[in-house]
């Protein structure tokens, strides 16, 4: 008879999970000559620790610090990018951008990208059927707390100007209820970062409001402004010219607004 | 009985080295982090440096970055710090700890030994 | 200079109840621990992962942990818990660090 197992409301964890997480570490190590040290199977225990037999509606931020400390990294702290709602095209700029970063060009980024995982309570077993939904079920799920432990972390250690990547094409273009509102924001240290820098995204061809004018827009760099840090935004009004002219600045087309 | 016993304390005048070791049995020693943890005479517990389960990683206190080693042989269930440059403000009884679980806390704690430096 | 604040001293009287605190920055995102050092001895766990109990230590410790502080308490006080008690946690730099450490006196 099959043991009864709770029943969550999202997806369950990522098949093939530890296989993915390993070959993900040794491919990030081998491509960063920074991280040449990593003993990745120390890394994999170390996550494994973070949620096994841990009820997964009952993670802490406690339970990342193991994994924070192997994975640590240093990445010019000046050189961030933040985003929020449009993570594709934040991780293209950064391919052609190398000299910056965005949390998923880093080690702990770059292992949990775009993956689901929890255990179960008492059992030494990955639950590959249903995991816990944010919504639906519970906030404190091995997912969601990875994501603020290494985003909280990845917010602290920047400097300078900051920069975030907003997706204009949506009704809240900053949202406070995603994780740049809720814990990157509130995380940037004031007394290192001097600039917040918004570039807004905008999705249709004839698109030319000015999306820096958007009350959500305003209400950012009310919060920024509060927390003694100065804020600036910018329209991208043409991503796809964008990212080609961060290829090639040189190109003559590259001198007017983008 | 889960144990750990310290031993090399002595006596080393100033910029001299030693070599602790802390032998462990009664538990899987390969699958734990350890600590040496050190007291100055009169004073409260100090953190001196950590090494991770199959001693790929290793970490230190400011206080003894540069001067002092950790090192680990899992197959002799032994855990050492190496000490070299000694001054004067490493005086103390040394402890070895088996840390729970990372970041629990720690669970074991060996007896000490007391390293002097003076001339 | 150790991160994590302790009162030097604290007292109390056999039967007594007496708490001890702890406070620091890195406590809100580490867990706490907590060691009794008996006079001429070595430390020894008394709580573990905030607020958890190894087997053998009497329920009359306990302790709790909220935001940036944390707490151990000593119910029905014996004269054997005269000893130095500490906090630890990890740092910022996710590193052990422990607290002043508290002298507790049994009067």
């Known amino acids: 008879v099959p043991r009864w197992r709770q029943q969550w409301s999202g997806p369950g964890t990522t098949k093939r999970f530890p296989e993915t997480v390993l070959a993900r570490c040794v491919k990030y190590t081998e491509i960063h000559p920074e991280m040449r040290h990593v003993d990745c199977q120390s890394v994999w225990d170390a996550f494994k620790g973070a949620f096994i037999s841990k009820h997964p509606c009952n993670i802490t931020e406690e339970d990342y610090q193991p994994l924070m400390k192997l994975g640590t990294q240093t990445v010019p702290c000046n050189k961030i990018l933040l985003w929020s709602r449009i993570k594709d095209l934040a991780h293209q700029f950064t391919q052609v951008q190398r000299d910056m970063f965005t949390l998923e060009d880093t080690l702990l980024g770059y292992l949990a990208d775009d993956l689901t995982w929890c255990g179960e309570f008492n059992t030494s077993k990955i639950n590959y059927q249903s995991c816990p939904d944010w919504r639906k079920d519970c906030s404190n799920n091995p997912v969601s707390v990875f994501w603020k432990t290494v985003s909280r972390r990845f917010a602290e250690a920047a400097c300078d100007v900051v920069h975030v990547m907003l997706n204009g094409s949506r009704s809240k273009i900053f949202d406070k209820n995603s994780t740049f509102g809720s814990v990157e924001v509130h995380n940037l240290q004031p007394e290192k970062v001097q600039t917040l820098e918004a570039w807004v995204i905008h999705g249709g061809r004839e698109d030319s409001r000015d999306l820096c004018q958007d009350p959500t827009i305003k209400e950012l760099e009310s919060i920024i402004s509060k927390r003694n840090i100065q804020f600036s935004c910018k329209n991208i009004y043409r991503p796809d010219k964008f990212l080609q002219c961060v290829k090639n600045p040189e190109d003559s087309s590259c001198t007017s607004e983008i | 009985e889960v144990q750990l016993l310290e031993s090399g304390g002595d006596l080393v005048q100033p910029g001299g080295s030693l070599r602790l070791s802390c032998g462990a049995s009664g538990f899987t020693f390969s699958d734990h982090y350890m600590s040496w943890v050190r007291q100055a005479p009169g004073k409260g517990l100090e953190w001196v440096a950590d090494?991770?389960?199959?001693?790929?990683?290793?970490w230190y206190a400011d206080s003894v970055k540069g001067r002092f080693t950790i090192s680990r042989d899992n197959s002799e269930n032994t855990l050492y710090l190496q000490m070299n440059s000694l001054r004067a403000e490493d005086t103390a009884v040394y402890y070895c700890?088996?840390?729970?679980?990372?970041?629990?806390?720690?669970?074991?704690w060996g007896q000490g030994t007391t390293v002097t430096v003076s001339s | 200079q150790s991160v994590l604040t302790q009162a030097p001293s604290a007292s109390g009287t056999p039967g007594q109840r007496v708490t001890i605190s702890c406070s620091g920055s890195?406590?809100?995102?580490?867990?706490v621990s907590w060691y009794q050092q008996l006079p001429g001895t070595a430390p020894k766990l008394l709580i573990y992962?905030?607020?958890e109990r190894p087997s053998g230590v009497p329920d009359r410790f306990s302790a709790s942990k909220s935001g940036t502080s944390a707490s151990l308490a000593i119910s029905g006080l014996q004269s054997g818990d005269e000893a130095d008690y500490y906090c630890?946690?990890?740092?910022?730099?996710?590193?052990?660090?422990f607290g002043g450490g508290t002298k507790l006196t049994v009067l």
């Open positions: 090494i991770s389960a199959r001693g790929s990683n290793t």
């Open positions: 890195s406590i809100q995102n580490n867990y």
């Open positions: 700890a088996k840390n729970w679980n990372y970041n629990y806390g720690m669970d074991v």
């Open positions: 992962r905030n607020f």
């Open positions: 630890a946690s990890w740092d910022d730099s996710l590193n052990w660090v």
